[in-house]
Amino acid sequence: SGVFQLQLQEFINERGVLASGRPCEPGCRTFFRVCLKHFQAVVSPGPCTFGTVSTPVLGTNSFAVRDDSSGGGRNPLQLPFNFTWPGTFSLIIEAWHAPGDDLRPEALPPDALISKIAIQGSLAVGQNWLLDEQTSTLTRLRYSYRVICSDNYYGDNCSRLCKKRNDHFGHYVCQPDGNLSCLPGWTGEYCQQPICLSGCHEQNGYCSKPAECLCRPGWQGRLCNECIPHNGCRHGTCSTPWQCTCDEGWGGLFCDQDLNYCTHHSPCKNGATCSNSGQRSYTCTCRPGYTGVDCELELSECDSNPCRNGGSCKDQEDGYHCLCPPGYYGLHCEHSTLSCADSPCFNGGSCRERNQGANYACECPPNFTGSNCEKKVDRCTSNPCANGGQCLNRGPSRMCRCRPGFTGTYCELHVSDCARNPCAHGGTCHDLENGLMCTCPAGFSGRRCEVRTSIDACASSPCFNRATCYTDLSTDTFVCNCPYGFVGSRCEFPVGLP
């Protein structure tokens, strides 16, 4: 579909004569008839197969023709066609004299013809005008012509229909050949696919408009390349959506169980060695000179009673020093200058000569030790109590006093906080990580359900027959004050009145 356009520019008829040679009276009032048809080697009369058009009177004798697109499209003249342009044509232009106002062919005398020109040839579709001039004996016509495609038609022969669009069936304009030219940000055969944000994951991301990156379920991040782990996953990651692969030191479905308390919390102090012993459980091995569950307590070097034979220990910045009693010497007062004759054994210890009397040894009764039986046996020196338990000497034995929450001979067992039944008045106990919680029955409150809260025993309206109900706050019971004629704890029985 297109338009053959003919632009008349100048017509010269200086003598103002008709084709017959007869002059026009008073002058040749000239109009034109145009016939466009298929190519003919010799242009002959016959149907104007591509169309016809006529002009109004454009001037008298000789005149220039103004451009006039506004006045009904008079110049250039428009010959539209609804077919593929064949590339060739024949054109007949007739100049006629109009004696009156009726320009219809049947209203004109046959000799009103001024001139007739016929051309034929090839003509490609294009914007450029072809200028031509045809001269006869008495007239000259200057004109130009071209073929252009109608709106939305493209290609060498105006056969390709293309309408620019910007909706979800395409985002494009049309190229001169009728091919689509995608608007920025769009691609695909019909320019219907948006070009997503650069780097947007091909499978896990998509977009409905350019430079966007929308994530498919289970994916997140600006480029939709990060999987979403299982909901509630604490210390874990995923490689596919909804996974929860635990980080090192964590376990459980949600990776929220601490299997590496040592690393995550560093509970052991003073350079102690930490060993994981279960979920949220650990053991600290203290360096010499330290004690406590977390090795947080510094031991005096004298606490290990290094001085023997009754020597007294003095703490010093770089260690300790033993002050030996008479008859003893050495770093720990371990060497004796005494013999059995000096009765060196205390607390009923018996003395035995050694090395021909140059030395001696004491055999101590139970509960005493030391080279002179001078020390009571301390069964706590090995610090046998775990979890911060306090060691107590009890004659020949020892005993561990445990911290709250621990039990066992050596406080090695963790007891439930609820084991002591701490909740009063039938409260339900719940073990928590840092203590316990009591759920109290009706009428009680407080951390241990120890506080009695008054219950309105009358709330259930237990008294019948319009009796007045009173609450006994001391017992949380009710008392019914019966009206005349009723008895019973709820005033439920009528009394036979005289």
Partner: antibody, heavy 121, light 106 residues
Framework: EVQLQESGPGLVKPSETLSLTCTVS??????????WGWIRQPPGKGLEWIGD???????YYNPSLKSRVTISVDTSKNQFSLKLSSVTAADTAVYYC?????????????WGQGTLVTVSS | SYELTQPPSVSVSPGQTASITCSGQ??????ASWYQQKPGQSPVLVIY???KRPSGIPERFSGSNSGDTATLTISGTQPMDEADYYC?????????FGGGTKLTVL
């Protein structure tokens, strides 16, 4: 040959949600060459376009129905669905699902046989 | 909102040419489609992109679209062509149908 088949309840109570599914057979709903649309026709009246969806999940709705319409696609089942909330008697119509071809400028070259949905208490 | 207007009815004698118009603002700048719907049946696409026929549609169906008017032409109309005809176009991202024209073959 591609065929479309609507399914869903024929009776819906006012203020409830109308739900229909269109099952595509003989072709893939994941083709990049088509949008999948819903059109309705009240008894004795003309056609009204409701909305459509691309296999990626991009949706387009008639502005007059947008606040009440949801169209979704399930490529694994080769189905797409329509939900229309807060229905009234004016939503009584034959509901068609259709294939809209990009190569045909958006023309609907395949239609389901239609299902009548009546809104009544 | 964009509107497409069709005459409610058109009558034609068998063998004659029937023309059904569809008007809308600058419709010629959009692609028009035409659908045929017979009673109790689903619509059938007969013309797309103004003038193209899907396979299986007889040659007697043709279409044109320019200015504000699209036209469906049925040459040599047959009794079997009696049906409702709907034009359709896209306005931005919204599908718009004309009100429909009942073609009666006398």
């Amino acid at each position: 040959e591609v065929q479309l088949q609507e399914s869903g309840p024929g009776l819906v109570k006012p203020s409830e949600t109308l739900s229909l599914t269109c099952t595509v057979s003989g072709g893939s709903i994941s083709s990049s060459s088509y949008y999948w649309g819903w059109i309705r026709q009240p008894p004795g009246k003309g056609l009204e376009w409701i909305g459509d969806i691309y296999y990626t999940g991009s949706t387009y709705y008639n502005p007059s129905l947008k606040s009440r319409v949801t169209i979704s696609v399930d490529t694994s089942k080769n189905q797409f669905s329509l939900k229309l909330s807060s229905v009234t008697a004016a939503d009584t119509a034959v509901y068609y699902c259709a294939r809209q071809a990009l190569a045909m400028g958006g023309g609907s070259d395949k239609w389901g046989q239609g299902t009548l949905v009546t809104v009544s208490s | 909102s964009y509107e497409l207007t069709q005459p409610p009815s058109v009558s034609v004698s068998p063998g004659q040419t029937a023309s059904i118009t569809c008007s809308g603002q600058r419709l010629g700048d959009k692609y028009a489609s035409w659908y045929q719907q017979k009673p109790g049946q689903s619509p059938v696409l007969v013309i797309y992109e103004d003038s193209k026929r899907p396979s299986g549609i007889p040659e007697r169906f043709s279409g044109s679209n320019s200015g504000d008017t699209a036209t469906l032409t049925i040459s040599g109309t047959q009794p079997m062509d009696e049906a409702d005809y709907y034009c359709q176009a896209w306005d931005r991202d919204t599908g718009v149908f004309g009100g429909g024209t009942k073609l009666t073959v006398l």
